[in-house]
Amino acid sequence: APVRSLNCTLRDSQQKSLVMSGPYELKALHLQGQDMEQQVVFSMSFVQGEESNDKIPVALGLKEKNLYLSCVLKDDKPTLQLESVDPKNYPKKKMEKRFVFNKIEINNKLEFESAQFPNWYISTSQAENMPVFLGGTKGGQDITDFTMQFVSS
């Protein structure tokens, strides 16, 4: 069975959009009107992994770019990065664990938990124009809830 993917954009629960900030970083900020075209379109691939209740394992690539969000240790801290891959080999059903996120979808709100680092989530800051990062707390100051907007292929 080939990998199933969908194209989407993500906004945090404060309606901040995600845009590229340099070649290997995403940031979150409020966009309006034509500026909305700056937001990153993800190719969300449904990959094999541990399933439980509303957890679905996914990989988050940047559409038509050979970049995937991945989770690695940097200075002993789980860190979110954009990693370059060989486009001939990705996406694939059996993604390396650093690329896998458990998508938790409840009442149209999404969280993305790192499969590599349980209880660490894709997060944004309350402040504008700050990097998207991997956060180890839920329900605190940082934002871990997102909404997804489908984009036609």
Epitope: A1, F46, V47, N53, M148
Partner: antibody, heavy 118, light 106 residues
């Protein structure tokens, strides 16, 4: 937690149409990536995958049975249905529904036994 | 379609033994293989996916190996509750199952 339960007629006659219902809880078929399959098992025999439906209403069928199968869903009622037309005695089996985002079926219903007899 | 062949329809073993249940795919399925345990009157239970990844809650005595066409489910230190039917399944193309191997008490 995730639960699935199959229901349908216990007994049918050959040539009739079998309609099965899978009622589930603990997850939603509106969740992107989610899917439910139907699988059957004649008594004492192997498992046979029949059909799968995804959250986006994409459907997959076992090629050898495709002409007789229709899978559908009612997302708001948390139900998946399977219709098998023109049943015969070889369709006598326990029918299971199983949840899978992929095809390694992590959650199964208890099964419902369907007998086809003249 | 891809056939999954379990060469032994039944195998006999004793409590505490190690047993290997094998399965062969009719064509290369990479590691797209799952193993299930089924007890009489019950639904199958997922043990292994990706050929070698244990499903959550599955005891560590169950392990899977293989890739391509040849796959093995190993139960080390067989326990009384392990006597059951075991099925392999591929999901490289539309899912197909092996005919099953009944693990019996010697």
């Amino acid at each position: 937690q995730v639960t699935l339960k199959e229901s349908g007629p216990a007994l049918l006659k050959p040539t009739q149409t079998l309609t099965l219902t899978c009622t589930f809880s603990g997850f939603s078929l509106s969740t992107s990536g989610m899917g439910v399959s139907w699988i059957r098992q004649p008594s004492g025999k192997a498992l046979e995958w029949l059909a799968h439906i995804y959250w986006d209403d994409d459907k997959r069928y076992n090629p050898s049975l495709k002409s007789r199968l229709t899978i559908s869903k009612d997302t708001s009622s948390n139900q998946v249905f399977l219709k098998i037309t023109n049943v015969d005695t070889v369709d006598t089996a326990t029918y299971y529904c199983a949840r899978s985002a992929y095809y390694s079926f992590a959650y199964w219903g208890q099964g419902t036994l369907v007998s086809v007899s003249a | 379609d891809i056939q999954m062949t379990q060469s032994h329809s039944s195998m006999s073993t004793s409590v505490g033994d190690r047993v290997r249940i094998t399965c062969r795919a009719s064509q290369d399925v990479d590691t797209d293989v799952a193993w299930f345990q089924q007890k009489p009157g019950q639904a199958p239970k997922l043990l292994i996916y990706w050929a070698s990844t244990r499903h959550s809650g599955v005891p560590s005595r169950f392990s899977g190996s293989g890739s391509g066409t040849d796959f093995t489910l190993t139960i080390s230190n067989v326990q009384p509750e392990d006597f059951a039917d075991y099925y392999c399944q591929q999901y490289s193309s539309y899912p197909t199952f092996g005919a099953g191997t009944k693990l019996e008490l010697k």
